[in-house]
């Protein structure tokens, strides 16, 4: 029996009651020492939860009248009151007492954090932690084994294991994402540490394997065949090659490259969007030189961590046969341009020179030649250029011709070359006065006075400087009035050889002058210098003579 601290007269044992009982459970009696058994005392029950219990007012016996759930309420704190019915008053102060609800194993373990999902790298070693699952049991952990749990694996062997007491899931066998990329694991939690009568709960865990770069790219074909036209410019894409990689994402990114190309004619670039290798023409090809190529390409992953290099030894390779397709090419002249030379004055039909074009193609088509740029020349089917007229360097020293060659098998195939014809000088022009001289001598001129300075030109080209020789013609007998002196600088001076001239008696003198060049052979011309006598007045200045001559011509006379 129990007496409370106030040393009151209440007497009871500690009260306990089993949860979840369908039948009425009497848990004990309340009794006051003051109760003499004359049935005048009445017992009452007060407090929160008092409705779950009944009390025999006469005997003080307490019974649970409802099924109790410890997990809902494990402790009832009630108040007891005793009343003397004869006086209608409480005979003792209220007293608190406790009814404890005893646990039974009526709750199964529950996984409260569902759904479970974990990601773990493929090929992870045994023992790698994947995830921890935790179940909770609402039963009383301090009451036997009702809430003591054990975890076990219902589905997921042989790849996974679970630690029985912690719920930690670990890898027990390496997994390859490329074979299976996700696994459903079922974990069971049992209470009563798995003993008979235990309750259990299960949960599913979705375990996804993340990719690691454990696969190297491999060519789809061990041999590729591509073709390229010989007219293709450098940089042309001539075809694609492709490898596959069982990995995904960044681990499947690859780089293509040339492993072997003795000719160094091709390159391979990677299209990172399509993961294809594009074969590129690095150098122009020529069907006539080489029309079959073989290159070896390799492919490697872009990102390979050091620890995974073991999966990437010996890159995958493929062989690519490249066939060059012939293109009918235009003729090719032996020289980019021609400079031909011919002396002037040769008769028509003279050979100037020969140009030559060939068909670069295998069939070696014969050529036909055409010439434009001047009617002074013609060309035959051998490419020989001839004159159609006598050439005069002094008319044209250079001719700019265009020769066109066409293949007789395909006249669409045309090429042109410039032909520059230089006409050589021959000394076929005698020197002559460089200008028309209007020469005057004053009536009052003195002997030795300069009448005119003359110079000459020669239409011929001179390799060295021209040198002219001036002479007074020996046949010119009536001109002792004037004298010629060669200055030795391609000029000559005409001097008066007497004092005084008479305009009326001899108004005009004709002086015959010979001019010779220094060509081989030398050429000489006969030139007539007309010297008019002029009334210059006292000044002896011939500047006004031209005007006087003009007036004279027009019928005027000057005083």
């Amino acid at each position: 029996d129990y007496k409370d601290d106030d040393d009151k007269a209440w007497v009871w044992r500690p009260f306990v009651v089993l949860e979840e009982m369908d039948d009425i459970q009497c848990v004990g009696k309340l009794r006051s020492d003051l109760d003499n058994g004359n049935n005048s005392f009445q017992y009452k029950l007060l407090g929160i939860g008092a409705g779950s219990f009944s009390i025999n007012e006469r005997t003080g016996e307490i019974c649970a009248i409802q099924k109790l759930d410890r997990e809902e309420k494990s402790l009832y704190i009630l108040r007891a009151q005793v009343i003397d019915t004869t006086i209608g008053k409480a005979v003792e102060t209220e007293s608190e007492f406790v009814i404890r609800v005893l646990d039974i194993n009526d709750n199964e373990p529950k996984f409260l954090d569902e759904p479970y999902e974990a990601i773990v790298p493929e090929m992870s070693p045994e023992g790698t932690l994947v995830i921890q699952v935790t179940a909770s049991d609402a039963d009383d952990p301090s009451s036997g084994n009702n809430a003591r749990l054990l975890y076990s694996l219902l589905q997921g062997q042989p790849y996974f294991s679970v630690e029985p007491t912690t719920g930690v899931i670990r890898i027990s066998s390496k997994m390859d994402r490329e074979l299976q990329d996700e696994y459903w694991v079922i974990i069971q939690a049992k209470d009563m540490i798995g003993q008979p009568g235990a309750l259990s709960g299960t949960t599913s865990v979705l375990i996804k394997l993340s990719d690691v770069n454990d696969n190297k790219p491999i060519f789809k074909e061990s041999l590729y065949r591509l073709t390229v036209s010989e007219s293709a410019p450098t940089g042309t894409s001539i075809g694609t090659i492709m490898a596959y990689d069982n990995d995904i994402g960044e681990n499947a990114e690859m780089d293509y490259s040339i492993e072997e190309d003795d000719s160094q004619t091709f390159d391979i670039i990677t299209n990172h969007e399509t993961q294809e290798g594009i074969v590129i023409l690095k150098k122009k090809v020529d069907f006539e030189h080489q029309n079959h190529y073989g290159i070896r390409a390799k492919v490697k992953n872009h990102h390979v961590p050091e620890q995974l290099m073991k999966y990437h030894t010996e890159a995958s390779t493929t062989f690519i046969k490249i066939q060059v397709e012939d293109v009918d090419e235009p003729p090719v002249f032996l020289l980019p341009y021609y400079i031909l030379e011919i002396p002037e004055g040769k008769p028509y039909g003279t050979i100037v020179g020969t140009v030559s074009a060939t068909d670069p193609d295998r069939r070696q088509s014969p050529m036909r030649y055409y010439l434009t740029g001047s009617k002074m020349f013609d060309i035959n089917d051998n490419g020989t250029i001839i004159t159609t007229n006598m050439l005069d360097r002094e008319v044209s020293a250079w001719y700019n011709l265009t020769v066109t060659a066409t293949e007789t098998y395909n006249v669409q195939q045309i090429s042109s070359a410039h032909v520059y014809v230089q006409v050589f000088n021959i000394n076929d022009n005698a020197p002559e006065f460089s200008q028309f001289y209007e020469t005057y001598v004053c009536e009052n001129a003195e002997s030795g006075e300069i009448v005119q300075i003359i110079s000459a030109i020669d239409r011929d080209e001179s390799i060295e400087d021209h040198h002219f020789y001036f002479n007074h013609s020996l046949e010119d007998t009536n001109n002792s009035s004037f004298m010629l002196t060669d200055n030795q600088d391609n000029t000559a001076v005409i001097l008066s050889n007497r004092t005084g001239f008479n305009l009326k008696e001899e108004p005009v003198f004709y002086m015959i002058i010979l001019i010779a060049d220094n060509g081989i052979p030398s050429l000489t011309s006969t030139n007539t210098l007309t010297i008019q006598v002029c009334d210059c007045g006292d000044s002896r200045n011939t500047e006004t003579c031209a005007n006087k001559g003009l007036l004279f011509i027009m019928g005027f006379r000057t005083e």
Partner: antibody, heavy 120, light 107 residues
């Protein structure tokens, strides 16, 4: 392993057309990257390549014979054929069919050859 | 076209000796584009070497190839009785041409 077998008449009259067929076994004529050739060998002489064909029908011929040669392919029968027109005695030879290699244009597989005589 | 010249025309040697066969091209060819064949009487040619030093499947290692540019060599390190026959070189860069052949006979 790929095997090749030539067939066709052993005697052809001058000015007529020589026709030979090569049957491929142990592999498909449509295999990517392989070319199928005809090669001949004049009695007691060296080898002369005639031309080749790819399974798509694209052909390429020796320039010296180009005007007289036609090579065709029949993928359904796994065969390819040679036609050489306007034959003369100079075309008398053993004719071989061959397939090129997986690492180049060399001739890896050969038929056993068939002798064709041009004579009236 | 590229012309191949083989020398010597005939090579007389004894079994066990070393044979060196030469093939010369009329102009430069890449070493990757040359092959060697063996032809026994009444048989089709048989690929020995390509590229120019890779042995074809099933070819004994006594056969080896070398060279570059215009000069190429086939070497048989120790002649076996079955090696006495005709050998051809072939270029496959600019169209396809064969050499005239070298006959290896027993001295």
């Amino acid at each position: 392993q790929v095997q090749l077998q030539e067939s066709g008449p052993g005697l052809v009259k001058p000015s007529q057309t020589l026709s030979l067929t090569c049957t491929v076994s142990g592999g498909s004529i449509s295999s990517s990257g392989y070319y199928w050739s005809w090669i001949r060998q004049h009695p007691g002489k060296g080898l002369e390549w005639i031309g080749y064909i790819y399974y798509t029908g694209s052909a390429y011929y020796n320039p010296s014979l180009k005007s007289r040669v036609t090579i065709s392919v029949d993928t359904s029968k796994n065969q390819f054929s040679l036609k050489l027109s306007s034959v003369t005695a100079a075309d008398t030879a053993v004719y071989y069919c061959a397939r090129d290699g997986s690492s180049g244009w060399y001739f890896q597989y050969w038929g056993q050859g068939t002798l064709v005589t041009v004579s009236s | 076209e590229i012309v191949l010249t083989q020398s010597p025309g005939t090579l007389s040697l004894s079994p066990g000796e070393r044979a060196t066969l030469s093939c010369r091209a009329s102009r430069n060819i890449s070493s990757s584009y040359l092959a060697w064949y063996q032809q026994k009487p009444g048989q089709a040619p048989r690929l020995l070497i390509y590229g120019p030093s890779s042995r074809a499947t099933g070819i004994p290692d006594r056969f080896s190839g070398s060279g570059s540019g215009t000069d190429f060599t086939l070497t048989i390190s120790r002649l076996e009785p079955e090696d006495f026959t005709v050998y051809y070189c072939q270029q496959y860069g600019s169209s396809f041409t064969f050499g005239p052949g070298t006959k290896v006979d027993i001295k």
